[in-house]
């Protein structure tokens, strides 16, 4: 079980995601749910609350092939949606190191 | 005018307490993460704390854990820090700084600061 | 923490020079590097992000390369109005660090 005080945070943040949702691409937030009114977005779930690997799955664009509800319609993402160098300078080794923090 | 005002700096003795507020405008307050940031006489630049932009959660740096607090008021577009059990360590000018959350995480946005003192 | 090196930390240069400034990190940060610009009893001001996105309104002359642990701001003809103190800052991880400074004065 991951430790619930594990964080990530700024670019960690962005660059775990990435690993996590490879080809797949990642939203900051996600349409509400039935069980949750607001969405809170992942800046402040994974970096003021509590992260683990299924939370940041949950921020892939496209569901994964194992998952059977593909009718969720595509976030709209917001106007101020990231300037970060996405898919710059892959890093390997550290987006491993940033999992496998989340999966003790 | 994007625009961040500082106030409530001043002298204060150590184990003394202090609020400063942050009054925003030109912009929507309510979806960005804010920030305190301090700068000590002659030094340079240091992270206090953040807020995310619904209130609910903060995070702070070491230093300062425990003894400052912020929080926002998003009905005034306002900001704060309570600042506790000062310490001589603590005196700076602080800055309030928007957050731009989705671009980096950069601090585009800056009042003027406020100097805040602690002297016996 | 992620620990943030500057050089040279002062530096006199004249109008028209070509100024570079490098930023070290502790460990590797991507391309997330921002560098400010402060001028005495004045807030810091954002110039680039992302270690090359120029701020807008931040005139050409400023430019930021760099990657994992070495950057560099350059200033490609030195203005009046470009001497301060120049940070950079990594948001990597929390906490979010600054360099110590480089101070950009006239020759």
């Known amino acids: 079980a991951y430790r619930p005080s594990e964080t990530l945070c700024g670019g960690e943040l962005v660059d775990t995601l990435q690993f996590v949702c490879g080809d797949r691409g990642f939203y900051f937030s996600r349409p509400a749910s039935r069980v949750s009114r607001r969405s809170r977005g992942i800046v402040e779930e994974c970096c003021f609350r509590s992260c683990d690997l299924a939370l940041l799955e949950t921020y892939c664009a496209t569901p994964a092939k194992s998952e059977r509800d593909v009718s969720t319609p595509p976030t709209v993402l917001p106007d101020n949606f990231p300037r970060y160098p996405v898919g710059k300078f892959f890093q390997y080794d550290t987006w491993k190191q940033s999992t496998q923090r989340l999966r003790r | 005018e994007v625009q961040l005002l500082e106030s409530g700096g001043g002298l204060v003795q150590p184990g003394g307490s202090l609020r400063l507020s942050c009054a925003a405008s030109?912009?929507?307050?309510?979806?960005?993460?804010m920030a305190w940031v301090r700068q000590a006489p002659g030094k340079g630049l240091e992270w206090v704390s953040s807020i995310v932009s619904s209130g609910g959660y903060t995070k702070y740096a070491d230093s300062v854990k425990g003894r400052f607090t912020i929080s926002r008021d998003n009905s005034k577009n306002t900001l704060y820090l309570q600042m506790n059990s000062l310490r001589a360590e603590d005196t700076a000018v602080y800055y309030c700084?928007?957050?731009?959350?989705?671009?980096?995480?950069?601090?585009?946005?800056w009042g003027q600061g406020t100097m805040v003192t602690v002297s016996s | 923490d992620i620990q943030m090196t500057q050089s040279p930390s002062s530096l006199s240069a004249s109008v028209g020079d070509r100024v570079t400034i490098t930023c070290r990190a502790s460990q590797s940060i991507n391309t997330y590097l921002n560098w400010y610009q402060q001028k005495p009893g004045k807030a810091p001001k954002v110039l680039i992000h992302a270690a090359s996105t120029l701020e807008s309104g931040v005139p050409s002359r400023f430019s930021g390369s760099g990657s994992a642990t070495e950057f560099t701001l350059t200033i490609s003809s030195l203005q009046p109005e470009d001497f301060a103190t120049f940070y950079c800052?990594?948001?990597?991880?929390?906490?979010?660090?600054f360099g110590p400074g480089t101070r950009l004065s006239s020759k």
């Open positions: 700084a928007k957050d731009m959350t989705y671009s980096g995480d950069a601090f585009d946005v």
């Open positions: 800052q990594q948001s990597y991880s929390v906490p979010f660090t």
């Open positions: 030109g912009f929507t307050f309510s979806e960005y993460v």
